[in-house]
């Protein structure tokens, strides 16, 4: 019997759409596969940025196969080909691997690109990104940012750029039609004539970034001699009222503290007849229901109720 | 919430300065521009000009020929808007608004601070 | 700058019927994939109001019936189905460039 061999695929590459890290590997069938016409042949693709400790690794019967990595750092990534053991008629056969790399060419030293990079989704409405300029880098330095998500055509550069001594610091951005839950890509490169300038990019989701506004209408109610509601409401905006968490900080005659995170827009408090004032703060989070990370608000303004008489069936600044 | 709150009426002489204030609260004073806009009796609206309150950085509008001063104070969350050596065609209600950038529009405003020019 | 022509000047319909106002930019207000055209609406003693922003986008609060359409330098607010309070005059606004500039506004007014 003849060893079944079988080649790795044909011009296997990474290729850059413009997209600041969302990357395209492509591939063509191996060579020699006439005698495999009736078999579907596989091909196991691994990648990752190099430094990582861990391959990614798919099987797929595509040419092709998209994902984003993280373009301060180069790519790696090998093929095979699979063929199953439905085609030779015994134990599946792999080729040999086929490599490649991918790395943008860096300009600039390290400490000239943009930093401590911030970004906050405000309120799931407004996207605002600011950073500082690199570590000596002179007032001729200019930075721009550019942006991509999936739904894009291309790359758009930022619109409305925040700016400190005439150099940007900061980006508003229009608004962004569909573009949470998937990955946001940011780049942001810089010009100088004095010397080059290194690019920093960026990955992240927008729902992660939230920071909502502060609930509204806080109000009391008397449940009973010894019981009561502090209601508010959820935020003006676009966020469901499925998406909060809320922290409250309560202050009872100005010694008692009391903080309590709950998921509703109401809170039950226990009280004495001795209580002579009482205040609450409310603010929210988005919760992992609907992101995996957030910001919280600021706090809502103060709810104050002073007075003798707690046995009020409403209680309203 | 959102409230953007202007100072109150005021009758100059021509010549004179007037300093209108624009005090915003319900939201991040610095994370939205302010717009000033004015509107003569009877007459359209036009723009005067804005500040970026996160750097101080401002665009007027050149109409205005350098007599419109736009400032603002963040930690006090207002926005100021000065113009000198009034004239009667001066006299117009002058509103202060919000926008998040261009793509945006201005999408709250002030009541409005009506200025009277007059001898 | 930018000028921008409204018309008609005034606008005579009745409650329940269909509103078409135009607004015509002397150069495109198109930039980065966007038409940076705005509508407000003004009533009398009151501080306008956006409706439209970025020429097709509805501004917090509007009511459906109101849309905006366009790019370029040619754009349309229409009111689908006209209510009492609907009746105002309304401006658009370009904020593509410096100076932003108002159209000279359309008065919608009850036939």
């Known amino acids: 019997d003849t060893e079944i061999k079988v080649n790795p695929p044909q011009d296997f590459e990474i290729v850059d759409p413009g997209y600041l890290g969302y990357l395209y590997l492509q591939w063509q069938p191996p060579l020699s596969l006439d005698h495999f016409k009736e078999c579907t042949v596989e091909y196991e693709l691994k990648y990752r940025n190099i430094g990582s400790e861990t391959w990614k690794t798919i099987i797929t019967k595509n040419l092709h196969y998209k994902d984003g990595f993280d373009l301060n750092k180069g790519i790696e990534a090998k093929i095979h080909t699979l063929l199953p053991w439905q085609c030779t008629n015994g134990s599946e056969v792999q080729s040999s691997w086929a490599e490649t790399t991918y790395w943008i060419s860096p300009q600039g030293i390290p400490e000239t690109k943009v930093q401590d990079m911030d970004c906050v989704y405000y309120n799931w409405q407004y996207l605002l990104c600011s950073w500082k300029p690199g570590i000596g880098v002179l007032l001729d330095t200019n930075y721009n940012l550019f942006y991509w998500y999936e739904g894009l055509d291309h790359a758009l550069q930022c619109v409305d750029y925040i700016k400190a001594d005439g150099q940007n610091i900061g980006c508003r951005f229009p608004y962004l039609e569909a573009s949470d839950y998937k990955d946001f890509y940011i780049c942001v490169n810089g010009s100088s004539e004095n010397k080059p300038i290194r690019s920093s990019y960026f990955t992240f989701q927008l729902q992660n970034i939230v920071k909502p506004l502060p609930p509204v209408y806080l109000t009391f109610t008397r449940e009973s001699s010894c019981e009561i509601k502090l209601k508010w409401s959820i935020p003006l905006g676009p966020i469901p009222a499925r998406c909060f968490d809320y922290e409250i900080e309560i202050r009872e005659d100005d010694t008692t503290l009391v903080t309590a995170t709950v998921e509703n827009e109401t809170y039950t408090l226990k009280t004495t007849n001795e209580t002579r004032q009482l205040c609450f703060v409310v603010r929210s989070k988005v919760n992992i229901y609907c992101s995996d990370d957030g910001i919280w608000s600021e706090w809502s303004d103060k709810q104050c109720w002073e007075g003798e008489d707690l046995s009020k069936k409403t209680l309203l600044r | 919430q959102v409230q953007l709150v202007q100072s109150g009426a005021e009758v100059k002489k021509p010549g004179a300065s007037v300093k209108v204030s624009c005090k915003a609260s319900?939201?991040?004073?610095?994370?939205?521009?302010m717009n000033w806009v004015r509107q003569a009796p009877g007459q359209g609206l036009e723009w005067m000009g804005r500040?970026?309150?996160?750097?101080?950085?401002?665009d007027y509008n050149q109409n205005f020929k350098d007599r419109v001063t736009i400032t603002r104070d963040t930690s006090a969350s207002t926005a100021y808007m000065e113009l000198s050596s009034l004239r009667s065609e001066d006299t117009a209600v002058y509103y202060c608004?919000?926008?998040?950038?261009?793509?945006?529009?201005?999408?709250?405003w002030g009541q409005g601070t009506s200025v009277t020019v007059s001898s | 700058e930018i000028v921008l022509t409204q018309s008609p000047a005034t606008l005579s319909l009745s409650p329940g019927e269909r509103a078409t106002l135009s607004c015509r930019a002397s150069?495109?207000?198109?930039?980065?994939?966007?038409?940076?055209m705005n509508w407000f609406q003004q009533k009398p003693g009151q501080a306008p109001r956006l409706l439209i922003y970025?020429?097709?986008r509805q501004g917090s609060g509007i009511p459906d019936r109101f849309s905006g359409s366009g790019s370029g330098t040619d754009f349309t607010l229409t009111i689908s189905r006209l209510e009492p309070e609907d009746f105002a005059v309304y401006y658009c606004?370009?904020?593509?460039?410096?100076?932003?500039?108002f159209g000279g506004g359309t008065k919608l007014e009850i036939k």
């Open positions: 970025a020429a097709s």
């Open positions: 606004q370009q904020s593509k460039e410096v100076p932003w500039t």
């Open positions: 608004a919000r926008g998040y950038g261009t793509a945006y529009g201005v999408d709250y």
């Open positions: 500040i970026d309150p996160y750097d101080g950085d401002i």
């Open positions: 150069e495109s207000v198109d930039n980065y994939g966007i038409s940076f």
């Open positions: 319900g939201y991040t004073f610095s994370n939205y521009l």
